[in-house]
């Protein structure tokens, strides 16, 4: 499980790096952050470390009330401050890892560690 969490953390951070450059990656991370009410890997300050993102900005999907541009010049009280790795990881442990055997190849850097079906399942429960 520790290895799964470590891989998920690495993958999440790698995808954060790709966020400004890749619309598909952005939409997946946006969905995760909005659905799990989280922001960044460990916490919202992870976004300021992304070189191509302005330091006073987080994705709009971090906002408590998501509107276009709400993440620009954000106020902490208006965003989810908790990180996604712990939040999603806890949910994965509880709802996915106990029901699925995740193979080594599923943990590869470019593979999604959480499937669209899993997100759909979370969204509707």
């Amino acid at each position: 499980r520790d290895k799964v969490m470590s891989e998920f953390n690495n993958n999440f951070r790698q995808q954060m790096e790709n966020y400004p450059k890749n619309n598909h990656t952005a939409s997946i991370l946006d969905r995760m952050q909005a659905d799990f009410k989280c922001c960044g890997a460990a916490n919202y300050t992870d976004w300021e470390k992304i070189p191509s993102m302005s330091k006073n900005r987080v994705p709009d999907s971090c906002c408590i009330n998501v509107t276009v541009g709400c993440g620009i010049n954000f106020n902490e009280k208006a965003i989810h401050k908790e990180g996604c790795v712990e939040k999603i990881g806890g949910w994965l442990r509880k709802n996915v890892l106990e029901q699925k055997l995740i193979s080594e190849e599923d943990l590869g850097g470019e593979q999604k560690l959480i499937s669209e079906e899993d997100l759909h399942h979370h969204h509707h429960h």
Epitope: N43, N56, C70, N73, F74, E76
Partner: antibody, heavy 119, light 108 residues
Framework: QVQLVESGGGLVKPGGSLRLSCATS????????MNWIRQAPGKGLEWVSY????????YYADSVRGRFSISRDNAKNSLYLQMSSLRADDTAVYYC????????????WGQGTTVTVSS | DIQMTQSPSSLSASVGDRVTITCRAS??????LNWYQQKPGKAPKLLIY???SLQSGVPSRFSGSGSGTDFTLTISSLQPEDFATYYC??????????FGQGTRLEIK
Amino acid sequence: QVQLVESGGGLVKPGGSLRLSCATSGFTFTDYFMNWIRQAPGKGLEWVSYISNSGSIRYYADSVRGRFSISRDNAKNSLYLQMSSLRADDTAVYYCVRDPRQIYGMDVWGQGTTVTVSS
Amino acid sequence: DIQMTQSPSSLSASVGDRVTITCRASQSISSYLNWYQQKPGKAPKLLIYAASSLQSGVPSRFSGSGSGTDFTLTISSLQPEDFATYYCQQSYSTPPITFGQGTRLEIK
């Protein structure tokens, strides 16, 4: 009513240190980012530093980075600026400024405290 | 860093005049532009936020417009208390928070 009151300014020699304080009242301090902004005699406004609601994020102007340190005590509703290795060009009125962020401007300013760096 | 350039740097006008001050950003800042008024010996005061929204308590003769890189502050009919220095400021991409160099409005 909303108030920001700065203190701690004064005359200091080059290379010296000073700690500015800003006591706030009349609003929920933790709802806001806070800034220090300065104005040298006869000059325009220069942003110095800001700190986020919780203190997790702190940024500085290039001109003061490594010499100044911003902090806040949310239990005391207070903002601070520790200034060291002071130079003549740090001479200015220093304002404590409330910032709601997002699309809103810096909506409340203190009266300012004067820092003079001279031998 | 985003640079803010105001023009003119100083301006002489009479009571009752309509006055316009412009502010240009070195890159697009959407509508993240604020205007402040400062009188001698006093702290600045927020007039306009988000390019065109009037701050509470500010007289309606003040108005702001623009988006992207070009912005204006207009005073429709100058009053004696309006003679002051005006600053624009961007909050779209920080740090740093950047101000224009100021426009000094004097009595003609």
